[in-house]
């Protein structure tokens, strides 16, 4: 079952509420939504020219 704010009055964003594991709270729409997993790559070996950019795992389609 999805859990989220019970009311959406105007643009007053309620505090984030617990979401089910596959979801996270979107401050923009003020609801629990489907979420993918963030993935921060391991740092490159010493001597690497620049830090690895942070990326993410795509959400389930």
């Amino acid at each position: 079952m999805r859990r989220g704010p019970r009311s959406l009055r105007g643009r007053d964003a309620p505090a984030p509420t617990p979401c089910v594991p596959a979801e996270c709270f979107d401050l923009l729409v003020r609801h629990c939504v489907a979420c993918g997993l963030l993935r921060t790559p391991r740092p490159k070996p010493a001597g690497a020219s620049s830090p690895a950019p942070r990326t993410a795992l795509q959400p389930q389609e």
Epitope: L27, L28, V29, A34, E61
Partner: antibody, heavy 125, light 107 residues
Framework: EVQLVESGGGLVQPGGSLRLSCAAS????????IHWVRQAPGKGLEWVAW????????DYADSVKGRFTISADTSKNTAYLQMNSLRAEDTAVYYC??????????????????WGQGTLVTVSS | DIQMTQSPSSLSASVGDRVTITCRAS??????VAWYQQKPGKAPKLLIY???FLYSGVPSRFSGSGSGTDFTLTISSLQPEDFATYYC?????????FGQGTKVEIK
Amino acid sequence: EVQLVESGGGLVQPGGSLRLSCAASGFSISSNSIHWVRQAPGKGLEWVAWITPTHGSTDYADSVKGRFTISADTSKNTAYLQMNSLRAEDTAVYYCARRVCYNRLGVCAGGMDYWGQGTLVTVSS
Amino acid sequence: DIQMTQSPSSLSASVGDRVTITCRASQDVSTAVAWYQQKPGKAPKLLIYSASFLYSGVPSRFSGSGSGTDFTLTISSLQPEDFATYYCQQSHNTPPTFGQGTKVEIK
């Protein structure tokens, strides 16, 4: 393959109406929010409206509030933008876009990752 | 509403240059900022989200940083295909708002 395809644009007189469609494939529009963003000729991007189809929540830019209505039909995997009382300043290319979210400490970290090709709306007499 | 102010509005650069575009929010938006690239007649493309996360498939020469009110998009070595207009956008609060854009032109 994820795809968004807009349709319904065209030439309309001031005060007239149009209904834009955004047909999604490769994902379910129920999973997140769908947005309409417009771009007037030679200008920047302006957000117009969003909907979360699962919850039916919506919001609108002040410039279109009371004139435009965003909706979604999850059975058709399609979002719509009903535009009434159109004005010359509504002339723009209208894009629909999907917002993607990644879980960052329980909160969405995201952006609009897939966009349609755009449909031109011209309001002129 | 939160205003997003980009600078510069346009810049001229050469292939291989390091390019930096800044975006300032009118109030704290944490890290809820995305960057987009748009070419004439095309839809925008997501480059960076949550201020510093590189979107899938985007070349690593693009990077983002910042939090609070000040954000930066950097292209470490400008390539011919990077000449375009770039937009920042906040999604901390509704309505989501875009910066006015920065056009990167060939010098």
